[in-house]
């Protein structure tokens, strides 16, 4: 017997869609071999209608597709706009039609139930709202209006204009009679249940002159949408439940093994701790729709998710829902990068952020996840150089190493910097990733003075001390601006053997500004790197003042002043919102740090170093 399995019988009605799932043993060969859906002819041959190699027959053009889910050992054939001609015997299979592994499927498309002439069909999802329109003639305007439900040969009164409401519809039905001149009344049923499914009869008046209109109400269970995302990547659930519940609390929940639904996040402030740091519920639009973004996808995130609306912020029968089945592909295109990066107070971190390498021109961003209420992620820095004021002088986003990875450097760390940060771009939203920064005990490896005051026209020398473990790394000084950190020209001095032997007195790289100008004022970073991979950094602020005494200044760490006060976070913070991820210009307005002027350049600035070897460190 064939190891391929699927539904033996599929039945539907004209105009509908079917989604036929076939299962196969997920061996390496099976996962990657051709999948097909073919129709068996009288001759016994099976004619391919659609395959995983992109073939679609003319009969199926524009209405069918085949999607392989190798991770799960399944493939799905979707066929829309069914006609009775589609009835027949089919095979879903692997390999070659004539001798591959296959499974027989019988598809029966019927005309659908015979409905009375002039019947209006209403197709609505469970939990939603339906408005049944009931026309009448002028002579029946003053008479009783009613809606009945046909059950077999009998008609059961549902609601009428004399204020009767059937108990099964209590608190969720209303009959509206318009003003004079409008010859139509409507019946609105909210929070539809499966049991509401059936044939209804509108009636105005009585006797032989009464007006009647049949309505066929089809209440559908929402078919879960299959969502297939990469491990470590991101998924967005877009939830549109309708205006009727625009002002009701919203939620996303995950179905557990008991078939109940555990809240993942809701608008009442509840959030599952398993999603800490990697989930946002984006504010809803006027129409009540909202979206939930989950980053850093794990295999255990797989499952069925429902979004819905209810005042309790959790699932209740008879309220609208939307459903998804999330599959997490372990054969991920998203590279592994550390999910936790550790740094010490006063030190620094260099975070590697992956992005889709096909989108090298995309704008890159880094934001700080905040868990309050529904979660938000104010942008801290972007590749165009805008940096939040409170991060002035200590945060930079670098395009290096490139080819699918950018780097974010944060220094002058404090315990307040501990938390979750998101890497994202204005391109492929599935590449959003999360990193947690932890502040641990320890001392920074690079040591520079605190505040430095330089005198106009004189020479300034700033030392940066590093430990022996960095002796073979490339050392650099750069001048920070809100568009990056411009490396300053370096000048080798002294024999390189001093570093090889790690001479105590030679473990420093110093920056010389000669002569000091007004443009030299600002933040300077001393750092180590290995090729395009950045390691630790240390920052020093140089203030420039008028000449008071002649002579050169050499600043040692002993003379360090306190670091300048941090500016507080501006209230109008940029945040990730529904649209902002697609178009960063749609973020809320904010103050940005002004560019710090010309970079110190030319021969005025030099970096004294006794090593020209290239290797790099990292604080991870």
């Amino acid at each position: 017997k064939s190891p391929v399995f699927g539904p033996q019988e599929v039945s539907s009605v004209e105009g509908n869609s079917v989604s036929i799932k076939c299962y196969y043993p997920p061996t390496s060969v099976n996962r990657h071999t051709r999948k097909y859906w073919c129709r068996k002819g009288a001759s016994g041959r099976c004619i391919t209608l659609v395959s995983s190699e992109g073939y679609v027959s003319s009969n199926y053009a524009g209405r069918a597709n085949l999607t392989n889910f190798p991770e799960n050992g399944t493939f799905v054939v979707n066929i829309a706009q069914l006609s009775r001609d589609d009835s027949g015997h089919y095979k879903c299979g692997l390999g070659i039609n004539s001798r591959g592994l296959s499974f027989d499927v019988s598809l029966e498309v019927s005309q659908g139930p015979e409905l009375p002439n002039g019947t209006e069909v209403y197709t609505v999802d469970v939990g939603r709202t339906v408005t049944i329109k009931c026309p009448f003639k002028t002579e029946n305007a003053p008479k009783t209006k009613a809606l009945y439900k046909k059950i077999g040969q009998t008609s059961v009164l549902v609601i009428d204009s004399r204020n009767y409401v059937n108990p099964n519809y209590k608190d969720r039905i209303r009959l509206r009679i318009p003003g004079t001149g409008q010859l139509i009344f409507t019946v609105v049923i909210d929070r539809l249940r499966l049991s509401d499914h059936g044939l209804y009869l509108c009636q105005a008046g009585d006797g032989s002159n009464r007006d009647e209109k049949n309505a066929d109400l089809q209440v559908l269970e929402p078919e879960p949408e299959l969502v297939y995302e990469d491990l470590r990547g991101s998924v967005t659930f877009h939830c549109a439940l309708g205006l009727e519940v625009a002002n009701v609390a919203k939620f996303l929940c995950r179905v557990n093994s008991r078939e109940t639904c555990d809240v993942v996040i809701n608008t009442l402030g509840k959030r599952d701790s398993a999603f800490e740091g990697r989930i946002l519920l984006n504010p809803q639009d006027k129409d009540g729709s909202f979206s939930v973004v989950i980053t850093g996808l794990r295999k255990e995130d797989e499952g069925r998710y429902l979004c819905g609306a209810h005042s309790d912020g959790q699932l209740q029968e008879g309220w609208p829902i939307q459903a998804w089945q999330l599959f997490v592909n372990e054969e991920s295109t998203i590279p592994r990068s550390p999910t936790v990066v550790k740094g010490v107070a006063g030190g620094s971190v260099a975070v590697l952020c992956p992005y889709n390498p096909k989108e090298s021109q995309s704008l890159k961003y880094w934001c700080l996840w905040e868990g309050a209420q529904n979660g938000r992620c104010p942008l801290l820095v972007e590749s165009q150089g805008l940096v939040q004021e409170q991060y002035e002088g200590r945060l930079s986003l670098l395009q290096e190493p490139g080819n699918g990875t950018f780097t974010v450097i944060l220094n002058q760390l404090t315990t307040q910097d501990a938390g979750f940060y998101w890497c994202l771009t204005n391109g492929d939203t599935r590449w959003r990733t999360t990193v947690e920064i932890k502040i641990i005990e320890g001392e920074p490896n690079l040591k520079v003075p605190g505040n430095v005051t330089a005198v106009l026209g004189e020479t300034l020398n700033i030392p940066c001390h590093f430990p022996c473990k960095f002796s073979s790394y490339e050392k650099y000084w750069c001048k920070w601006s809100n568009t990056g950190c411009q490396t300053l020209p370096s000048q080798d001095e002294g024999p390189s053997e001093a570093f090889v032997n790690c001479d105590e007195n030679s473990r420093l790289v110093s920056l010389t500004l000669n002569p000091v100008t007004r443009a030299d004022e600002g933040w300077y970073w001393c750092g180590v790197k290995q090729g395009h991979f950045y390691g630790e950094t240390a920052a020093v602020y140089v203030a420039v003042e008028e000449k008071k005494v002649a002579g050169s200044r050499y600043v040692s760490p002993a003379k360090a002043d306190a670091a300048p006060d941090e500016k507080v976070l501006d209230s109008g913070v940029r945040e990730i919102e529904n649209k902002a991820i697609q178009d960063p210009r749609l973020f809320a307005e904010e103050k940005v740090v002004a560019d710090t002027g010309d970079q110190a350049g030319g021969s005025r600035a030099s970096v004294d170093s006794s090593s020209s070897e290239e290797q790099g460190g990292s604080s991870k």
Epitope: V10, V18, E259
Partner: nanobody, 126 residues
């Protein structure tokens, strides 16, 4: 919580027919599939048939041993699923269990089903 109650089991002769019913009540949210499993004495519980639905579209899955002898169906209005068993054989003797799920995985897998009935005994004598 979903409650499932089976009925229709009994003692029949080989070649006879039986119709099992499974009534569902108390659903918290839509159930997409209901099925039948069976367990013969000293054997593991095994898949028999499942019906999955979406609006007016239905998907029916059967085990190999069924070979056209069994038919699964449902009555939406009554929230009930049936298993019509024809041409019964002695080897069909087992306790038959009804199960429900928001099925999206393999319909043959027991762990796909969150809710189970207490079972109804079917005995086929030769």
């Amino acid at each position: 919580q979903v409650q499932l109650v089976e009925s229709g089991g009994g003692l029949v002769q080989a070649g006879d027919s039986l119709r099992l019913s499974c009534a569902a009540s108390g659903r918290t949210f839509p159930t997409y599939a209901m099925g039948w499993f069976r367990q013969a004495p000293g054997k593991e519980r095994e898949f028999v048939a499942t019906i999955r639905w979406s609006g007016s579209t239905q998907y029916k899955y059967y085990a190999d041993f069924v070979k056209g002898r069994f038919t699964i169906s449902r009555d939406n209005a009554k929230n009930t699923v049936y298993l019509q068993m024809d041409s019964l054989k002695p080897e069909d003797t087992a306790v038959y269990y009804c199960a429900a799920t928001t099925l999206l995985g393999d319909p043959r897998a027991l762990n796909e089903y969150a809710y189970w009935g207490q079972g109804t005994q079917v005995t086929v004598s030769s």
